[in-house]
Interface confidence: low
């Protein structure tokens, strides 16, 4: 029986050209994390194997750097990363947890003047 | 549904030149990087040349065989990836295959390069 | 340039049984390592990216193993299906280099 949870960072919102981290945390399981990928939509940013360490796809190459942790930087955003991002751990015995963030990129001004949405 | 077409193969005589075409559909274009890769009949592949995306500039990299004398390049407002061959060689036939990031290739053309 | 060797050109295996395939990168490649099959006359397929994860529809008789320089395709419970060349190829840095390829057979 699946028993984990994952928490994320939510809707996050972050300024056009700057980094924001994707973090996400599995808890409520005593389940080995073997792998934990990174998605976009339909597109793979990132995997973080236990065993062979951190992989970044060529699209993502310069712009996605690994890590906090099991986290993800994003860094030089455009307006077009604004969407969708899913950590998809996938973990022995239970299975896959996958989590949800919703990231907005702002015009700085924009930001400069709060964020629309709050991290919980 | 990713498509990738690739279109203007064909005979040329050595020394010349030839523009191959690659029309993509299915994925924003803008977002991936695109490749040229080849294979001589019976031989293995070869990679040839990158393109980046426009987070990256649209840069671009080149095997060391085709260096000057190859050039990539993309149409963004039509989502068509070029490859410009020129002084072309008996050794640059093969099957040129365009690819995309992410494991999406085109069924190829063919060219020949004879005189 | 990062050199691919595919040690095998060719390999012959029974049908239902496993077979393994090596790469060895002339240099580190950080397991940015990704597998094809090609049948004759078609487009090569990416079985493998990251030199473990399997791409979606790929049947789990084939995964990917290594790190550093060496890395190994293998396919369990082989099928008529699966007879086709294999090629390894690096993105860790441009020129993107492909192995030379092995051909699977059945015995």
């Known amino acids: 029986m699946m028993t984990g949870t994952i928490e994320t960072t939510g809707n996050i919102s972050a300024e056009k050209g700057g980094s924001i981290i994707l973090q996400c945390h599995l808890s409520s399981t005593t389940a080995q994390v073997t792998q934990v990928n990174w998605e976009q939509q339909d597109q793979l940013l990132a995997i973080c194997n236990a065993d062979l360490g951190w992989h970044i796809s060529p699209s993502f190459k310069d712009r996605v750097a690994p890590g906090p942790g099991l986290g993800l930087t994003l860094q030089s955003l455009t307006v077009n990363d604004t969407g969708e991002y899913f950590c998809i751990y996938h973990t022995y015995p239970d299975g896959t947890y996958t989590g949800r963030i919703f990231l907005e990129v702002l015009e700085s001004s924009v930001a400069e003047h709060g964020a629309r949405f709050q991290i919980p | 549904e990713v498509k990738l077409v690739e279109s203007g193969g064909g005979l040329v005589q050595p020394g010349g030149s030839l523009r191959l075409s690659c029309a993509t559909s299915?994925?924003?274009?803008?977002?991936?990087?695109m490749s040229w890769v080849r294979q001589p009949p019976g031989k293995a592949l070869e990679w040839l040349a990158l393109i980046r995306n426009k987070a990256n500039g649209y840069t671009t990299e080149y095997s060391a065989s085709v260096k000057g004398r190859f050039t990539i390049s993309r149409d963004n407002s039509q989502s068509i990836l070029y490859l410009q061959m020129n002084t072309l060689r008996a050794e640059d036939s093969a099957t040129y295959y365009c690819?995309?990031?992410?494991?999406?290739w085109g069924q190829g053309t063919t060219l020949t390069v004879s005189s | 340039d990062i050199q691919m060797t595919q040690s095998s050109s060719y390999l012959s295996v029974s049908l239902g049984g496993r077979v393994t395939i090596t790469c060895k990168a002339s240099?580190?490649?950080?397991?940015?390592l990704a597998w094809y099959q090609q049948k004759p006359g078609n487009a090569p397929r990416l079985l493998i990216s990251?030199?473990?994860s399997l791409e979606t529809g790929v049947p789990s008789r084939f995964s990917g193993s290594g790190s550093g320089k060496d890395y190994i395709l293998s396919i369990t419970r082989l099928q008529t299906e699966d007879v086709a060349t294999y090629y390894c190829q690096q993105y860790w840095s441009t020129p993107f280099t492909f192995g030379s390829g092995t051909k699977l057979e059945i015995k």
């Open positions: 240099d580190h490649i950080n397991n940015w």
């Open positions: 299915g994925f924003t274009f803008t977002d991936y990087y």
């Open positions: 690819a995309r990031d992410g494991g999406y």
């Open positions: 990251g030199a473990t």
